[in-house]
């Protein structure tokens, strides 16, 4: 990492695929070396609760429930190592949810994919790329959030009731944009401001629902760093 450069933060949604980007600059002249390149990804998990054993999130077995700022700092471990011939190694058994895209690797993209990402995957990741006589590196911090949509009041509604839907993702900064939509047979239909739909940031207010409003409602939260999350809620309106 360059002196003074901050470790970039990558956000992901628990239960969804997460990409940990790693595309170091490699001159065109040396792209042929990528066929013989190897990469090793290491993970330094976030600290767990004090009573818990460190554990390795990407290894099988029980894991601490939530990352926290206190407790012992778990040891760094190798998530995955891919040699020049594509031979994979790491903590056994190697999990199928930890993946490198082989075609991407030949283009110089050594991104690690977690399919899906779990809460215990949070922490700092480092990749070391070995390219003949050069060692390149990537470093980033993975933060995981939970997405939810809540209805107030909750539960089934009757015709003419009001409801507020709140779309949220557990991330400290506010989303740059929020888009609401309905899932219809023909696909997504955007929800626009109208007497029936009032939009305010991550809230959608329906002053008078009808049975026609039953079904899936969704929102897309997009953040300034490009991260976006789609959340669905099934509304039930009784006739």
């Amino acid at each position: 990492l360059q002196p003074g450069a901050e470790v970039p933060v990558v956000w992901a949604q628990e239960g969804a695929p997460a990409q940990l980007p790693c595309s170091p600059t490699i001159p065109l002249q040396d792209l042929s070396l990528l066929r013989r390149a190897g990469v090793t990804w290491q993970h330094q998990p976030d600290s767990g609760p004090p009573a818990a054993a460190p554990g390795h999130p990407l290894a099988p077995g029980p894991h601490p429930a939530a990352p926290s700022s206190w407790g012992p700092r778990p040891r760094r471990y190798t998530v995955l190592s891919v040699g020049p011939g594509g031979l994979r190694s790491g903590r056994l058994p190697l999990q199928p949810r930890v993946q490198l895209d082989e075609r991407g690797r030949q283009r110089g993209d050594f991104s690690l994919w977690l399919r899906p990402a779990r809460r215990a995957d949070a922490g700092e990741y480092r990749a070391a790329v070995h390219l003949r006589d050069r060692a390149l590196s990537c470093r980033l911090r993975l933060r995981l959030g939970q997405a939810s949509m809540t209805a107030s009041p909750p539960g089934s509604l009757r015709a003419s009731d009001w409801v507020i839907l709140n779309c949220s993702f557990s991330r400290p900064d506010r989303p740059a944009s929020v888009h609401w939509f309905r899932n219809r047979g023909q696909g997504r239909v955007p929800v626009r401001e109208s007497p029936h739909h009032h939009l305010a940031e991550s809230f959608l207010f329906l002053p008078q629902v009808s049975p026609m409003d039953s079904g899936p409602w969704g929102c897309i939260l997009t953040y300034r760093d490009g991260f976006n999350v789609s959340i669905m809620y099934n509304l039930t309106v009784l006739g």
Partner: antibody, heavy 129, light 112 residues
Framework: EVKILQSGGGLVQPGGSLKLSCAAS????????MSWVRRTPGKGLEWIGE????????NYAPSLKDKFIISRDNAKNTLYLQMSKVRSEDTALYYC??????????????????????WGQGTSVTVSS | DVLMTQTPLSLPVSLGDRASISCRSS???????????LEWYLQKPGQSPQLLIY???NRFSGVPDRFSASGSGTDFTLTISRVEAEDLGVYYC?????????FGGGTKLEIK
């Protein structure tokens, strides 16, 4: 201090041959890719080609591949351009340049980049009968 | 081959002016690994070319911060915020994403 000294230019007849030299000092010559570029009166700068440190890869501009040969002698810290079958349009000022290794950093990823950071003073080639 | 087209051909300026040079490529110069290899060189009268900018927007060491560059895909720009006498010469863009590498035709920065 990095110094790149060129020699071998001069007057040559159409269809003739000429060998340009480029001697480097103050650098670990055997670590670097090297390039040849020329400046023609009508066309501005034109990339001729490049050679990697151990001479196993040489890239050429396709239009010049059959008449120019790039080579190097790491023991002598010298780069060469062998010109043959020259024509009047090869009249130009010829430059050799080192491809410097520039460390890069982008969104957590460290890498490197090659660019022509040190150039020779240029040597003039005139093709005329 | 990738054709690099620079505009204008000649750029008359007064000292202290802002100057912008445009460079357009005939095809995208992003290569497979997602990076764009575009450089800018300056050839001052009677001198060899010198590297100003590499990888689209990165100033080479020792290049004054009045030089900046930007762009993506096929459109690139070099800007000098306040032209000084030592900036006069011919500016070339240069793509290193596809072999053969190609220079733009050059833009001559001269005093009005």
């Amino acid at each position: 201090e990095v110094k790149i000294l060129q020699s071998g230019g001069g007057l040559v007849q159409p269809g003739g041959s000429l060998k340009l030299s480029c001697a480097a000092s103050g650098i670990d010559f055997s670590r670097y890719w090297m390039s040849w570029v020329r400046r023609t009166p009508g066309k501005g700068l034109e990339w001729i080609g490049e050679i990697n440190p151990d001479s196993s890869t040489i890239n050429y501009a396709p239009s010049l591949k059959d008449k120019f040969i790039i080579s190097r002698d790491n023991a002598k810290n010298t780069l060469y351009l062998q010109m043959s079958k020259v024509r009047s349009e090869d009249t130009a000022l010829y430059y050799c340049a080192r491809l410097g290794i520039i460390p890069t950093y982008h969104y957590g990823s460290s890498g490197y980049y090659y660019a022509m950071d040190y150039w020779g003073q240029g040597t003039s080639v005139t093709v005329s009968s | 081959d990738v054709l690099m087209t620079q505009t204008p051909l000649s750029l008359p300026v007064s000292l202290g002016d802002r100057a912008s040079i445009s460079c357009r490529s005939s095809q995208t110069i992003v290569h497979g690994n997602g990076h764009t290899s575009l450089e800018w060189y300056l050839q001052k009268p009677g001198q060899s070319p010198q590297l100003l900018i590499y990888k689209v927007s990165n100033r080479f060491s020792g290049v004054p911060d009045r030089f900046s560059a930007s762009g993506s895909g096929t459109d690139f720009t070099l800007t000098i915020s306040r032209v000084e006498a030592e900036d006069l010469g011919v500016y070339y863009c240069f793509q290193v994403s596809h072999v053969p590498y190609t220079f733009g035709g050059g833009t001559k920065l001269e005093i009005k």
